[in-house]
Structure formats: structure tokens, C-alpha cells
């Protein structure tokens, strides 16, 4: 009986550890600056790293610029977006800017896209300053279903800071759906 | 056998509860304003509370101004940094400010320091206003190894808001590394 | 014995799953704009949705404008607050604004209220711009006891963005208290 108990304990430790890991998808995606769109209009950012530097992904999929949910659950989603301009990189079209981020969820079954989180600021980046910088952070707790897709839209993509510590988004599963 | 089953259940409840708690290090550190550096340059903030007010730590270590990881895992890291200036505290050296935070990871084995997250804004704090305030929030999900150290650097440390609800950083473990 | 082991495994899977779900309260509350106070003073926001759109709640209670903790634990708390003004909605009383958020905890046993997190910025919203926008995000890890209440205060409530993706706050339990 004691041997059985040890076996139960052993298999349980193994099972608990395994199921715990399997139950916790995550992603941290960092901007791929080689392919950032130009212009000041709102665009969906499709180029992200998922496997270099701080970027990583597990039990989720990155495809066509979208983070795809593989496992139903409640997830904490976050994004950090940095914009910057140095006078040496040329003129801004306008000094009045709307620097925004939108984190959206797309359901393929019911083709629709909805904004989960938004953030940002209107800014006056005058020519009196040599350098301008601004960061946005958003985060929230959302129910996501397998197959749903998370994407990030920004205004003024040409002003994005291309560093991996500056412009990124991510998700991690916190709990199952009842 | 039933007695054994009860014992298994009992020990498992105990073990599960214990291992779950042991598996979840966390820290929430609040600024210790008695020792904030002056100046406008970028500095590492080394004085933080870990055991008063909202500040707390468990299964992590705070030493020499750094938050030390004791347990491998994936952690959610965050920082909230508030800057403020009131006209009664004297003139600013310049009205054009770069208010920034950098959350960095240092590995002792391979002596190197890397920025995990950055945020902030350039600001024009004109003399027309009696009071100026600005807050930065950053957060992200990172793989941390035992022995690695997390620290926070800011520009313009003399402008930091010393309240515990204003300037803080923290971490909590979300899952093990596979 | 094998039958007993299977029973142990079965009951454990069931128990583990059940206890895991029960152990993870959460809430994501979105602004109810039908009842936003006017003025520029600091007010407690009491109207939030908890069961429509992205808003949801489990093992926590929403009552009298406050999020009530039902289960002791360490929670990650967050808030995202967006302010906006369009010239078509009339003049601002002043162009110099203090746009702030305060996330507070109230203990009923010891009637007291304390700010856990604050964020925001002073802004100059000049008449030269058609549109102004600014978002604040705060987040942190806190020990909460059953019966404690979380509420959100803001300055300039009349400028709040009423969208569910813009103005929200939430919490999710990360771990038990030792």
C-alpha cells in the first residue's frame, strides 16, 4: 500500500507539474523594425519577433502578424508602445500628433474585430526640441477562446521605437474558463 | 485502504498547497525617499522598502538596491514611476525634460546588464504652471533565472514622487520554466 | 488497490480543478458612462459594468461602486483611464489640467481608505487643437483580505472616455496568503 501511495504521489507530482505547464500559454512579442509601415495613419503592426532576445512564445501561435490563442482561458494581455523622434531623422509632417495604441481581438468563426484596450495621448512635438519620446502602456484581463487572434494597431507607425525593450506586447494565461 | 486514501488526500492537499505557495515568489517594492539621488542624469535607484506599507517580498531577495531572483521561472514584472514638481520647490534647471524609466536585468554569471522594459516621455514643464506631474507604467512577462537581478533606473531622480502609491516596482512568478 | 488509486487520481483531478478555479477570483469592470459625475474635482467613480461586453466578475462582488474582495489573497490590480476632449463638446474651463487616477483600498473593519496606486499627468490642452486625448495605466501586486473594497477615483471625470476599451479597472488573484 505504501508503495502504491508513493506511486500515487509520484504520478501526481508529475501530472500536476505537467498539467500546470500545459495550462499556461504565454507570449511576449517584440517589434520587428525591419518592416514598420510609414505614414501617420492607423495601421496594424504585423512584424513581431517571437523567438529572439526577450521575445518568446509557448502554447500560442504567431501567424500573419497576429497572436493566435490555442487554449481557452482567461489571459492577462499587455502592450508597451514607445514613439520617438530625433530632429536628425527629418521633419515631422505636423507638430500635433495623436500617438495611440489599440489592442484588438478578432474572432474567425464570427468574422469581427473588437478593441479590447486602447491608450495614448495627443502630443505637441515642437521643433524647439531636439528629441521627443512618449510611451503607452495598457493591460487588462480578458476571456479568450481557442482560435481568436490578438493584434496591435498604432497611429504614426513611422515614429515607433524599434528597441525590444520599448515596443512589445504579450499575454499569459491566468486561469481556465469555468 | 480507505485510511491510506484519506492519508493520500490529506498529504496531497498539504503538499499541493505548500508547493503552490513555494512556487510563487513575488515582490512589491516602494521607493525609499530618504535616499533619492539628485540631478537630472540617469541613475539606478537603490533605496526601496520591502516590508512596510504596501511593500512586501516573498521567495525573492532585496539586496544592494536590486531585486534578486531565487527561483527560476517566468515572471510578470512591472514598474510605476511618478515625477512631480511644485513651484515652491524652486526652479527647474531646464523646462525641457526627459522623464524615463528603465527596468534592467543583470546576470552575475555573465556580468552584463540588459534593459527589459523602458517607458517615459519628453515633457515641457513651463513656469506658467504651479504644479507638474507625470507617471510612467511599464509591465511585461520575462524568463528569469535564479541569481539574476532586477533593478530600476530613472532620469531626473530628484523629481520622483516619494509616495508608496506613486513610485514602486514589483514582480510575481506566473509559471515554471519547462 | 488499483481501483482505489484510480479513484484517488479521479477525485484529485476533480478536486485540483475545482480548487484551482475557486482559488482564482477576478474582475474586469468597464466604465458605465450613463452616470459619470461632472466637474473637474476628484471623485470616486461608482458606476461600472460587470457583466456586459468585456466586463466580467467571478468570486468577487461589485456593490455601491466598489469591488469587494471575497477571498483573502495576493492580487494583481490594474486600471486604465482615458480622458478626451473634442472642440465640438464646448470650451474647457481651463487649458491647464491635472488628469489623475487613484486606486484605493477601504477596510470596513477599521474604517479607513488608502491609496494603493496613483498615476496621471498635468496637461496643457490648448484651443489650437481640435482633439485632446490622454490615457493612464497603473498596476501592482497587493495583499487583499476578504471584505476589503477597491475603488477608483479620478480628477476631471467629465473628460472620461466612456468606451469599454478605454476606461476600466480590474483584479485577478495570483496566490494565497501563506
Amino acid at each position: 500500500i505504501r508503495a502504491e501511495k508513493a506511486m500515487v504521489d509520484g504520478s501526481w507530482l508529475d501530472l500536476a507539474k505537467r498539467s500546470k505547464l500545459e495550462a499556461q500559454p504565454f507570449a511576449h512579442l517584440t517589434i520587428n523594425a525591419t518592416n514598420i509601415p510609414t505614414g501617420s495613419h492607423k495601421v496594424s503592426l504585423s512584424s513581431w519577433y517571437h523567438d529572439r532576445g526577450w521575445a518568446k512564445i509557448s502554447n500560442m501561435t504567431f501567424s500573419n502578424g497576429k497572436l493566435i490563442v490555442n487554449q481557452d482561458g482567461f489571459y492577462y494581455l499587455y502592450a508597451n508602445i514607445c514613439f520617438r523622434h530625433h530632429e536628425t531623422s527629418g521633419d515631422l509632417a505636423t507638430e500635433y500628433l495623436q500617438l495611440m495604441v489599440y489592442v484588438t481581438k478578432t474572432s474567425i468563426k464570427i468574422p469581427s474585430s473588437h478593441t479590447l484596450m486602447k491608450g495614448g495621448s495627443t502630443k505637441y512635438w515642437s521643433g524647439n526640441s531636439e528629441f521627443h519620446f512618449y510611451s503607452i502602456n495598457v493591460g487588462g484581463f480578458f476571456k479568450l477562446r481557442s482560435g481568436e487572434e490578438i493584434s496591435v494597431e498604432v497611429s504614426n507607425p513611422s515614429l515607433l521605437d524599434p528597441d525590444q525593450d520599448a515596443t512589445y506586447f504579450g499575454a499569459f494565461k491566468v486561469r481556465d474558463i469555468d | 485502504i480507505r485510511a491510506e486514501k484519506a492519508m493520500v488526500d490529506g498529504s496531497w492537499l498539504d503538499l499541493a498547497k505548500r508547493s503552490k505557495l513555494e512556487a510563487q515568489p513575488f515582490a512589491h517594492l516602494t521607493i525609499n525617499a530618504t535616499n533619492i539621488p539628485t540631478g537630472s542624469h540617469k541613475v539606478s535607484l537603490s533605496s526601496w522598502y520591502h516590508d512596510r506599507g504596501w511593500a512586501k517580498i516573498s521567495n525573492m531577495t532585496f539586496s544592494n538596491g536590486k531585486l534578486i531572483v531565487n527561483q527560476d521561472g517566468f515572471y510578470y514584472l512591472y514598474a510605476n514611476i511618478c515625477f512631480r514638481h511644485h513651484e515652491t520647490s524652486g526652479d527647474l534647471a531646464t523646462e525641457y525634460l526627459q522623464l524615463m524609466v528603465y527596468v534592467t536585468k543583470t546576470s552575475i554569471k555573465i556580468p552584463s546588464s540588459h534593459t527589459l522594459m523602458k517607458g517615459g516621455s519628453t515633457k515641457y514643464w513651463s513656469g506658467n504652471s504651479e504644479f507638474h506631474f507625470y507617471s510612467i507604467n511599464v509591465g511585461g512577462f520575462f524568463k528569469l533565472r535564479s541569481g539574476e537581478e532586477i533593478s530600476v533606473e530613472v532620469s531626473n531622480p530628484s523629481l520622483l514622487d516619494p509616495d508608496q502609491d506613486a513610485t514602486y516596482f514589483g514582480a510575481f512568478k506566473v509559471r515554471d520554466i519547462d | 488497490i488499483r481501483a482505489e488509486k484510480a479513484m484517488v487520481d479521479g477525485s484529485w483531478l476533480d478536486l485540483a480543478k475545482r480548487s484551482k478555479l475557486e482559488a482564482q477570483p477576478f474582475a474586469h469592470l468597464t466604465i458605465n458612462a450613463t452616470n459619470i459625475p461632472t466637474g473637474s474635482h476628484k471623485v470616486s467613480l461608482s458606476s461600472w459594468y460587470h457583466d456586459r461586453g468585456w466586463a466580467k466578475i467571478s468570486n468577487m462582488t461589485f456593490s455601491n461602486g466598489k469591488l469587494i474582495v471575497n477571498q483573502d489573497g495576493f492580487y494583481y490590480l490594474y486600471a486604465n483611464i482615458c480622458f478626451r476632449h473634442h472642440e465640438t463638446s464646448g470650451d474647457l474651463a481651463t487649458e491647464y489640467l491635472q488628469l489623475m487616477v487613484y486606486v484605493t483600498k477601504t477596510s470596513i473593519k477599521i474604517p479607513s481608505s488608502h491609496t494603493l496606486m496613483k498615476g496621471g499627468s498635468t496637461k496643457y490642452w490648448s484651443g489650437n487643437s481640435e482633439f485632446h486625448f490622454y490615457s493612464i495605466n497603473v498596476g501592482g501586486f497587493f495583499k487583499l483580505r476578504s471584505g476589503e473594497e477597491i475603488s477608483v477615483e479620478v480628477s476631471n471625470p467629465s473628460l472620461l472616455d466612456p468606451d469599454q476599451d478605454a476606461t476600466y479597472f480590474g483584479a485577478f488573484k495570483v496566490r494565497d496568503i501563506d
Epitope: H41, G127 | - | S129
Partner: antibody, heavy 117, light 107 residues
Framework: DVQLQESGPDLVKPSQSLSLTCTVT?????????WHWIRQFPGNKLEWMGY???????NYNPSLKSRISITRDASKNQFFLQLSSVTTEDTATYYC??????????WGQGTLVTVSA | DIVLTQSPATLSVTPGDSVSLSCRAS??????LHWYQQKSHESPRLLIK???QSISGIPSRFSGSGSGTDFTLSINSVETEDFGIYFC?????????FGAGTKLELK
Amino acid sequence: DVQLQESGPDLVKPSQSLSLTCTVTGYSITSAYSWHWIRQFPGNKLEWMGYIHFSGVTNYNPSLKSRISITRDASKNQFFLQLSSVTTEDTATYYCATRRETGFTYWGQGTLVTVSA
Amino acid sequence: DIVLTQSPATLSVTPGDSVSLSCRASQSISKNLHWYQQKSHESPRLLIKYASQSISGIPSRFSGSGSGTDFTLSINSVETEDFGIYFCQQINSWPLTFGAGTKLELK
């Protein structure tokens, strides 16, 4: 005070390149601001062509991108426009101008260039 | 590219009249619009920036209004020196574009 002066040929043959010089006095073109070429067609329509920034960065109108080049000679405080493969459609008055706080605040007096065989 | 449409193409007025010139953008450009005046045989001159902001040295009879897609340049009591062509220009995004102009002429 800042002054800008365009110079170059009045007549260019089709398929050739048009080359113009803008000489700036009263301000160094490598100190600040951006330095632009704008043209005005017969009938008065204005078209922004592109600029060279004080840092040396250039930005061109996509409609001209394959044909346009703006360069400078800092020692002479001059910047240049080159437009290749011209046609009669490129007949216009060409202005150089500087942009400050997003407005074209100083202009040259303009030079008329005719593209004709 | 953002297209700016000005109307009317020509406006015939008598000195002392007050006039309004219109500029419409093909998409919303907030207040990212400037106005220029060009007199005969001269280079354009900046009159108004960001839809309504005055420029140092420009007479106060010139004023601008509007945002989004619809903009107006007003001249309160036209003087003889005001005759010429008026252009709007968008600075919302590259490439910068101009309207075709409104010619203000003597009636």
C-alpha cells in the same frame, strides 16, 4: 534675414535631367530646419517635391521618387534639385523654400524652367 | 495622398467686402492645414498656420477656422493689396499637398 535664390537653366530638352541650385544666405543649411523644392505649374497648381534636412536626411514626394534627387554642398551653403527623364509636363516655376514650425516661411523668387525640344 | 479642394475657383470682390474662402480635405486632417497668399509675380507667403493660428506680421483681418475636413479663410474688409491667389496646404501627412487655389480678384 534668411534669403534663398534659385538658379539653373531656363530650358531643358525632354528626356534630359533638370538641375537647379538654391543658394542660401543668412542661415546655415546644416544648422537647423529642412530645405525644400516646390514647383508651380502653369495654371498655378503647387506641388511639393521633396526636402533635404539639416541632418542630411531626404524625403521625396512618392510621385517623383524614381526621378528626383536632392543634395547639398554645405561649404557653399547650397542645396540642389536633380530631376531626371523630364517631359513637357515638368514645365513649371521651381521654388526653393525653408520650412519652420511646419510652414514654408521663406521662399526663393522662383525660376521658370521650360521643357521643350 | 490627401486631396484638397478649394472653392470657389475665383471670387470677384470690391474693397471693403468681407469674404470667406473654403478648403475641403479628402479625409480628416484635424487642424493640420495652412493658408498661403500669392500675389502676382511673387512667391507664396504663409498667412495662417494650423487652421486658425495667426502669423506674426500678417494683418489681423485674416483669420482661419475649421477642423477635420472643412476649413475657411476669412478676410474681414478686403483691401486692394489682398488681391491674388490663396492656397491651402495640408501638413497632416507626407506628401504635403496644396489645394488648386482660389483667385481673389477685383470686381
